[in-house]
């Protein structure tokens, strides 16, 4: 398949990845679908350096990332290992809080106003960040 060698219009390149920052809010699943329709995924934070980059662009606004525990354990949407990977939770988070009164706990992770992470109700309409890697082969089947 073809490889993406430069970022699409309105995306920001950083360390061989492309990032797109929303200006509106969606529920986590709708944000995830939006990124996938762009052949991308919700942002996966793998280092303190990447955390700082994303934080700089989103500012002090609740923003979804590609991390959830809707099926049990915490998982990154691109398969990056959660247990051994970078984490930046707020103290005492994630807490799967049930006290919000919206039903269920909290299964989706977002950047908070100070950049650290919190788990929250996935239906909340937060902004989001899409990410796609440069030089990654597309999903198209090879030409025969």
């Amino acid at each position: 398949g073809s490889e993406r060698t430069c970022c699409p219009v309105n995306w920001v390149e950083h360390e061989r990845s492309c990032y797109w920052f929303s200006r509106s809010g969606k529920a986590w699943a709708d944000a995830d679908n939006y990124c996938r329709l762009e052949d991308a995924h919700l942002v996966v934070v793998t280092s303190w350096e990447e955390q700082k980059f994303v934080q700089h662009h989103i500012g002090p606004v609740n923003t979804w990332m590609g991390l959830h525990d809707q099926n049990g354990p915490w998982k990154w949407v691109d398969g990056t290992d959660y247990e051994t990977g970078f984490k930046n939770w707020r103290p005492e988070q994630p807490d799967d809080w049930y006290g919000h009164g919206l039903g269920g706990g909290e299964d989706c992770a977002h950047f908070t106003d100070d950049g650290r992470w919190n788990d929250d109700v996935c239906q909340r309409p937060y902004r989001w960040v899409c990410e796609t890697e440069l030089d990654k082969a597309s999903q198209e089947p090879p030409l025969l």
Partner: antibody, heavy 123, light 107 residues
């Protein structure tokens, strides 16, 4: 000028299969998600499926999930819809439609449509 | 799934009339709504996206408004070529859903 031209419709028996094609021109095909939307005779519009520009992500309406498969060949600027286990209720005009892109965060709306191809499922 | 309803289902009007069609979503969709016009035997044509943004080439007599669950499309002065069926569509989440349509015909 953007153009979308569907083909492959026709009469098929219940349980049969059909493959629709949509030839695109006038835009960078691989940069846009593409969709199929259908319209039963005398009825309204029903979204069927969408595929991302690179082909890596697909979504389907519940009514066709497991029976229909959307795909694309960006080297040929062509969109496909493989329809299996067809039912009478699949009878419709099938439109190929291009995802609009406004720079906003709309998930999926359609700024260009083909003329449609009629699929009739009947014994 | 998000259900879309439209009212009225049909409206009879004369050239020069102002016509307003309402679309309602079963849950909030912000402003992720599009409107299409369809004439018999033809493909739909995009008129408005993001609830109020006019698609290029669409006459300024068409306008859209609304946010959340309630939306409208208005035609300020109906022209002969505007007699058609109008559909709303939510662009917020999958599955994408359309309203049942509103037919605008000649009084």
């Amino acid at each position: 000028e953007v153009q979308l031209l569907e083909s492959g419709g026709g009469l098929v028996q219940p349980g049969g299969s059909l493959r629709l094609s949509c030839a695109a021109s006038g835009f960078t095909f691989s940069s846009y998600a593409m969709s199929w939307v259908r319209q039963a005779p005398g009825k309204g519009l029903e979204w069927v499926s969408v595929i991302s520009g690179g082909g890596g992500s697909t979504y389907y309406a519940d009514s066709v999930k497991g029976r229909f498969t959307i795909s694309r060949d960006n080297s040929k600027n062509t969109l496909y819809l493989q329809m299996n286990s067809l039912r009478a209720e699949d009878t419709a005009v099938y439109y190929c439609a291009k995802r609009g892109y406004s720079g906003y965060e709309d998930l999926l709306y359609f700024d260009c449509w083909g003329q449609g191809t009629l699929v009739t499922v009947s014994s | 799934d998000i259900q879309m309803t439209q009212s009225p289902s049909s409206v009879s009007a004369s050239v020069g009339d102002r016509v307003t069609i309402t679309c309602r979503a079963s849950q909030g969709i912000s402003n992720w709504l599009a409107w299409y016009q369809q004439k018999p035997g033809k493909a739909p044509k995009l008129l408005i996206y993001t609830a109020s943004s006019l698609q290029g080439g669409v006459p300024s007599r068409f306008s859209g408004s609304g946010s959340g669950t309630d939306f409208t499309i208005s035609i300020s002065s109906l022209q002969p070529e505007d007699f058609a069926t109008y559909y709303c569509q939510q662009a917020n989440s999958f599955p994408i859903t359309f309203g049942p349509g509103t037919k605008v015909d000649i009084k």
